[in-house]
Interface confidence: medium
């Protein structure tokens, strides 16, 4: 029950996280700036990964997409790539994790297969979250670096004259959305990996054996429960009786009216 809850919660947290990563990638408010630091001519500029918008104090807003790739900074291209990779990995992870959910039964899929799928999706979520966090952090670093570069240029540019109009860089809402979303995806991925440990069938577990009356005599073979120790040749819990003895897993492998898909 705890495993199912952990897996389900990990899935939901990752789902919210990936939705947030997609939202952050599409948002225009990655950086916000006052272009002309003047109360009368307040021109508010907010920029995203794909386009830039300018809103004036009068309310007039104009947006323009970045149509050229050549003129864009390499850092911006890197951020775009990281966010897209994060979304793609997250989307694949979600798809895999849906089939890995313990509450969903697909045919006669074994727990070991579900455990592997849960681990795969968990790793994908972790990498996806890291990509988003890295992308947002690179962009934030770019803003901070350029802020200090601009401040330095105030005293060195234009023949030593002080640049009185200084662009002020601030972190846009998308950065915070990206950080939170990346963190949630990361947490969701960790939860999926934890759930995987609970799903994986351990070799040292006792297997319940059901005995069925058989027409011929059943010869007892010594070392029949070697699987319980994890040592010896019978670590795969194979049948060790010639007769109608079957492990409980084998008995349950046939679909019944109580199986829900």
């Amino acid at each position: 029950m705890a495993v199912t809850a952990c897996q389900g919660l990990g899935f939901v947290v990752s789902l919210i996280g990936i939705a947030g990563i997609i939202a952050a990638t599409c948002m225009d408010q990655w950086s916000t700036q006052d272009l002309y630091n003047n109360p009368v001519t307040a021109v508010f500029n907010y920029q995203g990964l794909w386009r830039s918008c300018v809103r004036e104090s009068s309310g007039f807003t104009e947006c323009r997409g970045y149509f050229t790739l050549l003129g864009l900074p390499a850092m911006l291209q890197a951020v775009r790539a990281l966010m897209i990779v994060g979304i793609v990995l997250g989307a694949i992870g979600l798809l895999v994790s849906i089939f890995a959910l313990k509450c969903i039964r697909i045919g006669s899929m074994e727990d070991s297969a579900k455990a592997n799928m849960t681990l795969t999706s968990g790793i994908m979520f972790i990498v996806s979250g890291l990509c988003a966090i890295a992308g947002v952090s690179v962009f934030a670093n770019m803003l901070v670096t350029n802020f200090w570069m601009s401040t330095a240029n105030m005293y060195t540019g234009m023949g030593g004259m002080v640049q009185t109009v200084q662009t002020r860089y601030t972190f846009g809402a998308a950065l915070f959305v990206g950080w939170v979303a990346g963190g949630l995806t990361l947490i969701g991925g960790v939860m999926m990996c934890i759930a995987c440990r609970g799903l994986a069938p351990e070799e040292t577990n006792y297997k319940a054996v059901s005995y069925h009356a058989s027409g011929h005599s059943v010869a007892y073979k010594p070392g029949g429960f070697k699987a319980s120790t994890g040592f010896g040749s019978n670590t795969k819990n194979k049948k060790i009786y010639d007769g109608g003895a079957r492990t409980e897993d084998e008995v349950q492998s046939y679909p019944s009216k109580h199986d829900y898909v």
């Epitope: 990655w30 950086s31 272009l35 002309y36 021109v43 500029n45 920029q47 995203g48 990964l49 830039s52 300018v54 004036e56 009068s58 007039f60 104009e62 323009r64 970045y66 149509f67 050229t68 050549l70 003129g71 864009l72 900074p73 850092m75 911006l76 962009f139 770019m142 803003l143 670096t145 350029n146 570069m149 601009s150 240029n153 640049q163 109009v165 662009t167």
Partner: nanobody
């Protein structure tokens, strides 16, 4: 990087006219906002006029309203400032300013062109 080159400055009599031009060159020319600033000796730099990309939004400082006209030609990557009815108070070094729309881009400035108005 964007380079801005101003031209058109010079000596003019009060009441006369001058036309300043600013040409943008470089890989990223799609600047949203371009403007003209001026700085007289011993004074702070002030914004004279600015224009947005499409030319649909223009701002003028109160001191130049009705006398100066800002325009831009995106095809030629140029911006102009037509200055009419010049006054001695308009004498200053005029700087072209451009702001690229790409995130993290710098403010670009020209070297300036001197405008002198004689009484």
């Amino acid at each position: 990087e964007v380079q801005l080159v101003e031209s058109g400055g010079g000596l003019v009599q009060a009441g006369g006219s001058l036309r300043l031009s600013c040409e943008a060159s470089g890989p990223a020319r799609n600047n949203y906002y371009m403007g003209w600033f001026r700085q007289a000796p011993g004074k702070e730099r002030e914004l004279v006029a600015r224009i947005n990309l499409s030319g649909s939004s223009i701002y003028y400082a109160d001191s130049v309203k009705g006398r100066f006209t800002i325009s831009r030609d995106n095809a030629k990557n140029t911006m102009s400032l037509q200055m009419n009815s010049l006054k001695p108070g308009d004498a200053a070094r005029y700087y072209c300013h451009a702001r690229d729309i790409v995130p993290g881009a710098q403010d670009y400035w020209g070297q300036g062109t001197q405008v002198t108005v004689s009484a």
